[in-house]
Interface confidence: low
């Protein structure tokens, strides 16, 4: 804590200017008016204060705004933002996207800190949903942002926001997350024509059900193997050899290289060897000719 001492004669700050960098900590405490500091926060960033001096300035703002800083101050915090604790940020009410951008810019190039995490949480909660502009901003700064959200949090993303999502934003999403995002993407892109639709929906297909994959197989989409390998195993298993051949088009040759990996391995085990042989890829492990395939799950449902 900085002791309360009287400001030396002639040192009372009239402006936030570069002369303040020569002030000792106690002089900053005594000579800088907190209200002045609040109105001139934009100048603080242009002055090379030491970390210790910034601590004093933060302390002054904390005293002025014990319930949390107003947005007019928050927007101009600049590097002082790095001095804030998550506890401080939990008191804020940030509603402007410009404020959010300004603070994310300060942290640019670094891992997401709990300060930033708390800021984003406060901002999104304040808006009530993850709208397109917010998502655009967050994924620009943190490409992994979307995949860090829980399925419950993703359920608040409106379909209109899906337009802001780039393929790389989904790189680290797991199947549970894609299960939530895929129906939203399907809705968002529903009015596009076949080939354009496939380009947009491709990154989300890890959440697609069997019936949608069957429909895509009728549209000459030529899905690449990387996308196919990310599909849900339970969605791939019911596809016939002919449907997979149509779905992959010229990429069907890639199945051979992936025959030991899911979902290809499990899919092969469900196909008749006769049908697999028609692909001419030498895929092995299908159901031998003459064997009867019983769908036990169907039997159980009937009994």
């Amino acid at each position: 804590e900085v002791e309360k001492t009287a400001c030396p004669s002639g040192k009372k700050a009239r402006e936030i200017d570069e002369s303040l960098i020569f002030y000792k900590k106690w002089e900053l405490e005594a000579c800088v008016d907190a209200a002045l500091l609040a109105t001139q926060m934009d100048r603080v960033n242009a002055i090379p204060f030491t970390y210790e001096q910034l601590d004093v300035l933060k302390h002054k703002l904390d005293e002025l705004y014990p319930q949390g800083y107003p947005e007019s101050v928050i927007q101009h915090l600049g590097y002082l933002f790095l001095k804030m604790s998550p506890e401080d940020i939990r008191k804020w009410n940030v509603t402007s996207l410009e404020t959010l951008k300004a603070l994310l810019e300060v942290n640019k190039g670094h891992e997401m800190s709990p300060q930033v995490a708390t800021l984003i949480d406060r901002f999104v909660k304040g808006r009530g949903q993850l709208d397109k502009d917010t998502l655009d901003t967050l994924t620009a700064f943190y490409p992994g942002y979307l995949c860090s959200l829980s399925p419950e949090e993703l359920s608040s993303v409106p379909p209109s926001s899906i337009w802001a999502v780039r393929p790389q934003d989904l790189d680290t999403c797991d199947p549970r997350q894609l299960d939530v995002l895929y129906p939203k993407a399907r809705l968002a892109f529903q009015n596009m024509n076949g080939s354009e639709y496939f380009v947009k929906i491709q990154s989300f297909l890890g959440g697609a059900p069997t019936e949608d994959l069957k429909a895509l197989s009728q549209q000459n989409v030529s899905m690449d193997l990387a996308t196919f390998m990310k599909l849900r195993t339970d969605a791939v298993l019911p596809l016939t050899v002919a449907e997979v051949q149509k779905l992959l088009g010229p990429h069907v040759e890639g199945l051979k290289a992936e025959e030991r990996h899911r979902p290809v391995r499990d899919w092969i085990l469900r196909q008749r060897q006769d049908d697999l042989d028609t692909l001419g890829l030498g895929l092995q492990g299908g159901i031998p000719n003459g064997y009867l395939v019983l769908d036990l799950s169907m039997q159980e449902a009937l009994s």
């Epitope: 970390y51 933060k58 319930q67 949390g68 790095l82 001095k83 804030m84 604790s85 998550p86 506890e87 401080d88 939990r90 008191k91 009410n93 670094h110 891992e111 997401m112 800190s113 709990p114 300060q115 995490a117 708390t118 984003i120 949480d121 406060r122 909660k125 943190y142 992994g144 942002y145 860090s148 959200l149 829980s150 949090e153």
Partner: antibody, heavy 123, light 112 residues
């Protein structure tokens, strides 16, 4: 995996200071805060303070005059120093990570703890 | 400081029984924007505490679903639906809504 390893003396003379280092692995101090908590039979679990990822600190007012927490992000180390120890400071001292995912809501619980440093204050 | 009061001090149970521990705070733990930062920890003999439940009712990763938390405001409960031998130890509630963070005195779960 997430680990916090503590190193420090077991025996401290009365009126001397206690220094403990908490070396973390499996996560970055740029992204997570670290709390310090102590446990004694007489007083149970007591929260002493925290250093947040950005380097700012919050201390329990009862200890603020003799407690200092700092860190070196590049070495993944957090440093705890308490001055003027007396017999009633005898306790097990723990460092613990401030819990939460990097991006979604932080939950401000201590999700991973160090093994503890048993400190006896005696001459 | 916020005082956390746990009851009972000791809870003898038979394996397979349900156990219930209560925690009461001296002031509301609802944070200014709605979250309630009340957590539960288990400490086994000779070990560090381990997080079980965070923010009233969320199980930490790896915690079995026989553990559940509930409550609001100032009154909170931890329930174990079917006690197993590995659940024995001292349970602590803790709040992190207000600084300083504070802990309850602990409840020892032991075999009847």
């Amino acid at each position: 995996q997430v680990q916090l390893k503590q190193s420090g003396p077991g025996l401290v003379q009365p009126s001397q200071s206690l220094s403990i280092t908490c070396t973390v692995s499996g996560f970055s101090l740029f992204s997570y805060g670290v709390h310090w908590v102590r446990q004694s039979p007489g007083k149970g679990l007591e929260w002493l303070g925290v250093i947040w990822s950005g380097g700012s600190t919050d201390y329990n007012a009862a200890f603020i005059s003799r407690l200092s927490i700092s860190k070196d992000n590049s070495k993944s180390q957090v440093f705890f120093k308490m001055n003027s120890l007396q017999a009633d400071d005898t306790a097990m001292y723990y460092c613990a990570r401030n819990g939460g995912s990097m991006i979604t809501t932080l939950y401000y619980a201590m999700d991973y703890w160090g093994q503890g440093t048993s400190v006896t204050v005696s001459s | 400081d916020v005082v956390m009061t746990q009851t009972p001090l000791s809870l003898p149970v038979s394996l397979g029984d349900q156990a219930s521990i209560s925690c009461r705070s001296s002031q509301s733990l609802v944070h200014s924007y709605g979250n309630t930062y009340l957590h539960w920890y288990l400490q086994k003999p000779g070990q560090s505490p381990k997080l079980l439940i965070y923010k009233v009712s969320n199980r930490f990763s790896g915690v079995p679903d026989r553990f559940s938390g509930s409550g609001s405001g100032t009154d909170f409960t931890l329930k174990i639906s079917r006690v197993e031998a590995e659940d024995l130890g001292v349970y602590f509630c803790s709040q992190s809504t207000h600084i300083p963070f504070t802990f309850g005195g602990g409840t020892k779960l032991e075999i009847k």
